[in-house]
Every structure is written in C-alpha cells, then in structure tokens.
C-alpha cells in the first residue's frame, strides 16, 4: 500500500539529521499527493480518451470545483497569508467529497486513490494547525455533500469518466497553486 510521507524508511530521521519543520512536512505532503494524482491519471488516460479532450470542452461541466482566484490572496499580487491559508483549507475541504467520489472509480489504482484521500485529510489537519483564523473556514454541509455524491454516481459512464478526469486535473492545479503560495509564507 502507498505510504504517507514520514512513514517510509527514507523519511525516518537519520542520526543527527534535523526533523522536518511544519512547513517542510506540508510541502512534502503536497508533493506526495501530486504524485498520487499523477498515478491515478495514468489509469484514467489508459481507459478513456478524456486526456485528449481540450480544456475548453472539459470546461463545459456543472462541477463547482475549487479554484484559486485573485481575491483569495494566494497570488503574489495581493498576497495575504491569512486569507490564502483559509482559501487553501476551505478548498481542500470542498475537494473531499470529490475525492470520496473517486474511491470506486479505479481498479488497479484503488489503493492509490485511498492514499490520496487519506493524505489530503492529514494535510488539512497540518494546515489547520498553521492557520490563525479558523473561524473563517467554512466546512461543507454533510447533507449537501451526500446529495452531490449521489448525483455524481448516477451519471452515465462517459460523464463519470469526464468527472473523474476533471476532478484530478482541478485538484492538481489547486495543489500546485497552494504549494507556490505556501512557499511564500
């Protein structure tokens, strides 16, 4: 099974080596999740032609996937550490329902899908410890998530393939933006 960063032998602190700082641990965690997403996308691309679809064609969807915008304070122009951290955590919490949807979408990469989901939960916990303004973080309503999940699972096969591809691509771009921003903090 895929291991979380810090669980494999490479990450065990060698004698006299410095333990990872909170920021380094978060950085490493995001890179680990991105590796997992990339592995999942390989399976998706091998079984459907979604990866060849243009970004514009894929944009014609009803998914409300989290995305970084200028107002979120994560871009260098208008950078705001507190606002940005809230956006990253809120976005990750919003992605959780979509990561749950992915759990039954993979055959050979089932464990990888689980690892991405679990390490995202751990990442959220790390970031919540770092955040000062926890009150500003809105958690999605469980009932809303449940009905969204039901709706996504009721789609036909082609739409489910499209949804899977879109979730993975959007999650990748959200994490890349988050990593760039976190390295400025």
């Amino acid at each position: 099974a895929p291991v979380l960063p810090g669980e494999d032998s490479k990450d065990v602190a060698a004698p006299h080596s410095q333990p990872l700082t909170s920021s380094e641990r978060i950085d490493k965690h995001i890179r680990y999740i991105l590796d997992g997403i990339s592995a999942l996308r390989k399976e998706t691309c091998n079984r459907s032609n979604m990866c060849e679809s243009s970004k514009e064609a894929l944009a014609e969807n009803n998914l409300n996937l989290p995305k970084m915008a200028e107002k979120d304070g994560c871009f260098q122009s208008g950078f705001n550490e507190d606002t940005c951290l809230v956006k990253i955590i809120t976005g990750l919490l919003e992605f959780e329902v979509y990561l749950e949807y992915l759990q039954n979408r993979f055959e050979s990469s089932e464990e990888q899908a689980r690892a991405v989901q679990m390490s995202t939960k751990v990442l959220i916990q790390f970031l919540q410890k770092k955040a000062k303004n926890l009150d500003a973080i809105t958690t999605p309503e469980p009932t809303t998530n449940a009905s969204l999940l039901t709706k996504l699972q009721a789609q036909n096969q082609w739409l489910q393939d499209m949804t899977t591809h879109l979730i993975l691509r959007s999650f990748k771009e959200f994490l890349q933006s988050s990593l760039r921003a976190l390295r400025q903090m």
Partner: antibody
Framework: EVQLQESGPGLVKPSQTLSLTCTVS??????????WSWIRQPPGKGLEWMGV???????YYKPSLKSRTSISRDTSKNQFSLQLSSVTPEDTAVYYC???????????????????WGKGTLVTVSS | QAVLTQPPSMSGTLGKTLTISCNGT?????????VSWYQQLPGTTPKLLIE???TRVSGIPDRFSGSKSDNTASLTISGLQSEDEATYYC??????????FGGGTHLTVLG
Amino acid sequence: EVQLQESGPGLVKPSQTLSLTCTVSGGSIATSYYAWSWIRQPPGKGLEWMGVIDYDGDTYYKPSLKSRTSISRDTSKNQFSLQLSSVTPEDTAVYYCARAGLGDSYYLGTYYAMDYWGKGTLVTVSS
Amino acid sequence: QAVLTQPPSMSGTLGKTLTISCNGTSSDIGSGNYVSWYQQLPGTTPKLLIEGVTTRVSGIPDRFSGSKSDNTASLTISGLQSEDEATYYCASYRETNNVVFGGGTHLTVLG
C-alpha cells in the same frame, strides 16, 4: 543525451493552419516529470513562449495565442506537436521545441526553465 | 512586446564584470524563485545558463551568476570573455500557468 528535432512545412499560406512536430530522442516523453514546450522567434526579434504540454498531458498556452494554439503529444512515437490556426505573416518565425521542468517544476506548475532545445525550423507565412 | 524589460544592448570590457537587469512585476519575477537566463550566440539555439534565479546549469562556468530583488532579476558575468558576446534573455513563470521572456540584451565585448 536528449535531442529534439522540429519538422513541418517551411511555407504556410495566410489563414491556414501551421503544423509542426517535435521528435524526441535519448529519452521518453512519457517518463519523468518533464514538460515539452514550443517557443518561437521572429527574424531579428526576441523569444516568445507559446505553450507547454506537461507530464500528465495538460496544456497551457500564452493567453494572447490561446484561441489559435493547440499542443498535443503521441507518446508511442515520442513526439509532441504544435498547431497554430489562422496564421498571418506576423507568425513568420523560427519555431523551437524544448524540454522544460527542472527541479520542482512539476509540483509547482512552473515550466520556465528549458534545458534542451531543438535546432529550430523557419516557418514563413506568405501567399 | 516583451513582458519582461531588459536593456536592448550593453557593452563590457574584457576581464571586467557586467550585470544585465530584467524588470518584471509581482505576477512574474516577484512571484517566487522562477527565473531563468539564456544565452543565444549569433545563428544558434538558446542555451540555458541559470534556473531557479541563482542555480547554474551543469557545465556553465561560475563566471555567470543570477540574483533577484523584488520584481527585478539580474545576470552577472564576471571576467568577461570575447565568447560571451551574445544575446541574453531572461524568462519567468507568470501567474497563472504561463511563461514570459524578456526582450533580450545584446552584449558586445570590447577589447
């Protein structure tokens, strides 16, 4: 040693689509976290980044060229391609393909450093 | 019209030190350590010298060094040699998922 070679017609008529292919040797475009870029240079002018296709097959384009540009890849042939539609004489340039993605570029989505380049191919847009 | 601003031409003396500047904004050069520098000798392909603002690429002599302050990046060439006569380009990642080049600086090395 990674080598890149551009190929395609040297002359394209205005309003037509310019199509170029970059063949990569000495390394697979489907392995490691590299991305593959297109850059052009009009005669006597500077370099202009056009777009990139990353390890996952995701594409990103220069905003002002986005509506006319398409980059795709064929991993079985170890090639990636550029299509530029509705060309005008202003699109006359030497077109380069290049490899990008040193360091943490994949994780950050920052493909600004191109370490291996093709020799370039001159494309003239003229009737 | 290049997004990053470089002086179009500069000249330096053999053996001396010269610095080429590259001015951008908080959306590109200021957005992180995502700056590279290229050397293009007449009639040849651009060659990567520096990536990540300061990291010299393998095989590039330590006479070449890169730095950054706020929205301005710099390439410094010390101990100028005649073979350094070329056009130098800076490039940077630009938010979001974009790359921009400078207009290029043609360097002439004087005896």
